[in-house]
């Protein structure tokens, strides 16, 4: 039978190395032993270059594509083979698709007048454009309370956040994760990074009294 | 040491064919586009025609679009430029050049870095 | 097409002086920060053209650091200083940026 796309390529660049498109196929397909996603750079002299689809589901299909630095002008032509049948062409500009990359090294530590201090990486080297660029969420959830969370922005440089003990409550389990997005280049959320989690042992005030 | 010597330049009629060759030696060949250059008697520099490294793209100034062909052999690590329906004003002497670094997604420019000692070519009746 | 102006197209200037070639597009030439698609030749007489400064402002391998370029969006300019008996010949500013890839006329430097 005839191979056709169900929802046709959608992509993001992670705007250092690697550009992801993920697509559905009607049916459940081979994804690498059938499909090839054929991708270049609008500039003179550009090589074409083919990438290897992986299965998602079944019929969820993903590219991963290494792609230079990006700049804000880098215009990508793509076209989705299934051998000599042209199933989908189309342009991707790496610029106007951002994913960041995932925080890394989420960490908590006693701090100071009963404080948690919740550090972080960012997930960019310091001559890259989204350095500086990003902001953060962080969420903080009760492992036993799913009523229990609080979400934060951290909209200032630094990947840390200072959280009161007394704001959560004394001898639960709490586990927090971050995501990233860079509003300037009004990207999508990152994934979140994974949890870290952490026994509240805060005593109340009125403990004491 | 990088090195380019073009040949195939001769005296041709208007309307005549002529195919020029570049030899290239001291460099990774595939992994470079390669460009055409000509020069009218006491006139300036004139692109002609530009291939990338796999031989995949190519692209040519519109006066000579449809007359001449770029191809390129990796393997024998040789430029051609095919000339058809050549006409007077293709008179020039022609230059093969080393262009951008085609093997990375984005091209990596150096400039046209190093240039063959040119071939004249002559079109008269 | 984009089109290239030099200016002048003639330059005569003493041994040891300082030589400025100007060169304009008709298009910007940036493709982003910092890659600015301009190079500069030079003919001397009876030889090929030698490559002297490529992307704006970084000298090809071998040039003197007497040669230096500047500029980017559509003005860029090529700075000879000191220049020597053995800088005679013509100046050519090239965009590689787009096709066809276009030159300016030429600037002809004569040493006095």
């Known amino acids: 039978g005839s191979v056709k796309v169900l929802h046709e390529p959608s992509c993001f660049s992670d705007y250092i190395s690697t550009s992801v498109c993920q697509w559905k196929m009607d049916h459940p397909t081979n994804c690498s032993a059938e499909l090839r996603l054929s991708y270049q750079l609008d500039f003179m002299g550009s090589e074409n270059h083919t990438c290897v689809p992986e299965n998602r589901e079944d019929s969820v299909c993903v590219c991963s594509m290494p792609i230079d630095d990006a700049v804000e002008a880098d215009v990508y032509q793509l076209d989705l083979w299934a051998g000599q049948q042209l199933l989908w062409s189309g342009s991707f500009q790496p610029s106007k698709h951002v994913k960041p990359r995932t925080p890394g090294n989420l960490t908590v530590h006693p701090n100071i007048s009963h404080t948690w201090l919740l550090m972080w990486t960012n997930p960019y080297p310091t001559e890259n454009h989204l350095h500086s660029e990003l902001t953060y969420m962080v969420n903080v959830s009760n492992d036993n309370d799913p009523e229990d969370f609080k979400v934060y922005n951290v909209t200032y440089m630094g990947p840390t956040l200072r959280l009161a003990a007394s704001t959560l409550k004394s001898g639960a389990s709490y586990s927090a994760r971050v995501r990233a997005w860079a509003q300037t280049y009004n990207s999508t959320w990152s994934d979140w990074s994974p949890s870290t989690t952490w026994l509240n042992y805060y005593e109340p005030w009125e403990q004491h009294l | 040491e990088v090195q380019l010597v073009e040949s195939g330049g001769d005296l041709v009629k208007p309307g005549g064919s002529l195919r020029l060759s570049c030899v290239a030696s001291?460099?990774?060949?595939?992994?470079?586009?390669m460009t055409w250059v000509r020069q009218a008697p006491g006139k300036g520099l004139q692109w002609v025609s530009l291939?990338?490294?796999?031989?995949?793209?190519?692209y040519y100034a519109d006066a000579v679009k449809g007359r001449f062909t770029i191809s390129r052999d990796n393997a024998k690590n040789t430029l051609y430029l095919q000339m058809n329906s050549l006409r007077a004003e293709d008179t020039a002497v022609y230059y093969c050049?080393?262009?951008?670094?085609?093997?990375?997604?984005?091209?990596?420019?150096?400039?046209?870095?190093?240039w063959g000692q040119g071939t004249l070519v002559t079109v008269s009746s | 097409d984009i089109v290239m102006t030099q200016t002048p197209l003639s330059l005569s200037v003493s041994p040891g002086e300082t030589a400025s070639i100007s060169c304009r597009s008709s298009?910007?030439?940036?493709?982003?920060?910092?890659?600015?698609?301009l190079d500069w030749y030079l003919q001397k007489p009876g030889q090929s053209p030698q490559g002297l400064i490529y992307?704006?402002?970084k000298r090809a391998s071998g040039v003197p650091d007497r040669f230096s370029g500047s500029g980017s969006g559509t003005d860029f300019t090529l700075r000879i200083s000191r220049v020597e008996a053995n800088d005679t010949g013509v100046y050519y500013c090239?965009?590689?940026?787009?096709?066809?890839?276009?030159f300016g006329q030429g600037t002809k430097l004569e040493i006095k």
């Open positions: 050049a080393v262009d951008r670094k085609t093997k990375t997604i984005r091209p990596q420019y150096y400039g046209l870095w190093h």
């Open positions: 001291g460099f990774t060949f595939r992994d470079y586009a």
């Open positions: 291939i990338n490294g796999s031989g995949g793209k190519t």
């Open positions: 298009q910007s030439l940036t493709y982003s920060i910092g890659y600015n698609y």
């Open positions: 992307l704006g402002s």
């Open positions: 090239m965009q590689p940026l787009q096709s066809p890839l276009t």
